[in-house]
């Protein structure tokens, strides 16, 4: 079993504020009450839960840092999605902060890739056309990859 098995029974989250747990679990967008008898809605824009759960509290929504833009707001079933501002990127090694993209390539090198929220500019040697440092291209994930939580990452 992996985290892709999200629900005991795949059924739609009820719209009302309270409902009964199913096998002791509450659907996404809810948490369980202290006495275990009710599923209580998360508060839109304040907290959320993405999975079936027996949490006593929903999870607090992320607030985007300065230097980040909000791509999508926090809902009861999904956390805020933040992205680095234009001209900055987030490295795999330091996902906590956005770093400034380089403004140009070193002498003897040419730019082959632009600054994106996920990667710095791409520079290659003029003659050999080999990449100076490993760079990551992240392709938009397919529906299947979104379901399985895997996305294509190609290192040059």
């Amino acid at each position: 079993i992996t985290q892709q098995d999200l629900a005991p029974q795949q059924r739609a989250a009820p719209q009302q504020k309270r409902s009964s747990p199913s096998e002791g679990l509450c659907p996404p967008g809810h948490h369980i009450s202290e006495d275990g008898r009710d599923c209580i809605s998360c508060k839109y824009g304040q907290d959320y839960s993405t999975h079936w759960n027996d949490l006593l509290f929903c999870l607090r929504c992320t607030r985007c840092d300065s230097g980040e833009v909000e791509l999508s707001p926090c809902t009861t079933t999904r956390n805020t999605v933040c992205q680095c501002e234009e001209g900055t990127f987030r490295e795999e090694d330091s996902p906590e902060m956005c770093r400034k993209c380089r403004t140009g390539c070193p002498r003897g090198m040419v730019k082959v890739g632009d600054c994106t929220p996920w990667s710095d500019i791409e520079c290659v040697h003029k003659e050999s056309r080999t990449v100076a440092a490993p760079s990551v291209f992240i392709f938009p994930p397919s529906d299947e990859q979104l379901k399985s939580g895997t996305a294509s990452v190609v290192c040059l």
Partner: antibody, heavy 121, light 111 residues
Framework: DVKLVESGGGLVKLGGSLKLSCAAS????????MSWVRQTPEKRLELVAA????????HYPDTVKGRFTISRDNAKNTLYLQMSSLKSEDTALYYC??????????????WGQGTLVTVSA | NIVLTQSPASLAVSLGQRATMSCRAS??????????MHWYQQKPGQPPKLLIY???NLESGVPARFSGSGSRTDFTLTIDPVEADDAATYYC?????????FGAGTKLDLK
Amino acid sequence: DVKLVESGGGLVKLGGSLKLSCAASGLPFNSYYMSWVRQTPEKRLELVAAINSNGGRIHYPDTVKGRFTISRDNAKNTLYLQMSSLKSEDTALYYCTRLTYYGNPAWFAYWGQGTLVTVSA
Amino acid sequence: NIVLTQSPASLAVSLGQRATMSCRASESVDIYGNSFMHWYQQKPGQPPKLLIYLSSNLESGVPARFSGSGSRTDFTLTIDPVEADDAATYYCQQSYEDPLTFGAGTKLDLK
């Protein structure tokens, strides 16, 4: 206040059997996943068994599958672990835990004080 | 099984300083914007105690000196500032995949 009290540990011969119990109070026992986690003499932690609120879903790692059986009596607020065909590597401190569920059995929110199981030749 | 590697195995930090420990997973433990990594503190003779769940959520009653960060395969537990009561062994645990697995622990001593 949540309280989990384990009992039933002791010295047992290689290949022998033992049944552990855990009395729970301070929480709606019949609403929650429960589990047993053991800590070896080398201080390694390992999930031994997990069970959902009504006993319909059970998880075991391969190391104990077929030898250990987890069960619960919601009327008595008690969790059990029946251990058989015990091996020397089963020697450990066995903790009863309240397991939070988030898409899967997820993290261990409350722990008992543990009961020691020693398997000897 | 997902293997969790904790480093360093032990560290000594002065009171009031910052302690940082790492947990590396053999594969990503992220899905749907959540990192399924959790942290526990264990003092001698006591059971482990939950500190942080889902990488960065502080368990109720845990001092704000404790913080968790990281995503995918690399996670960090930070204690800042360290107090005398923090001498303990710290374990990470993943719940992305069955079986749930723990790291071997990082022992924090005070200088």
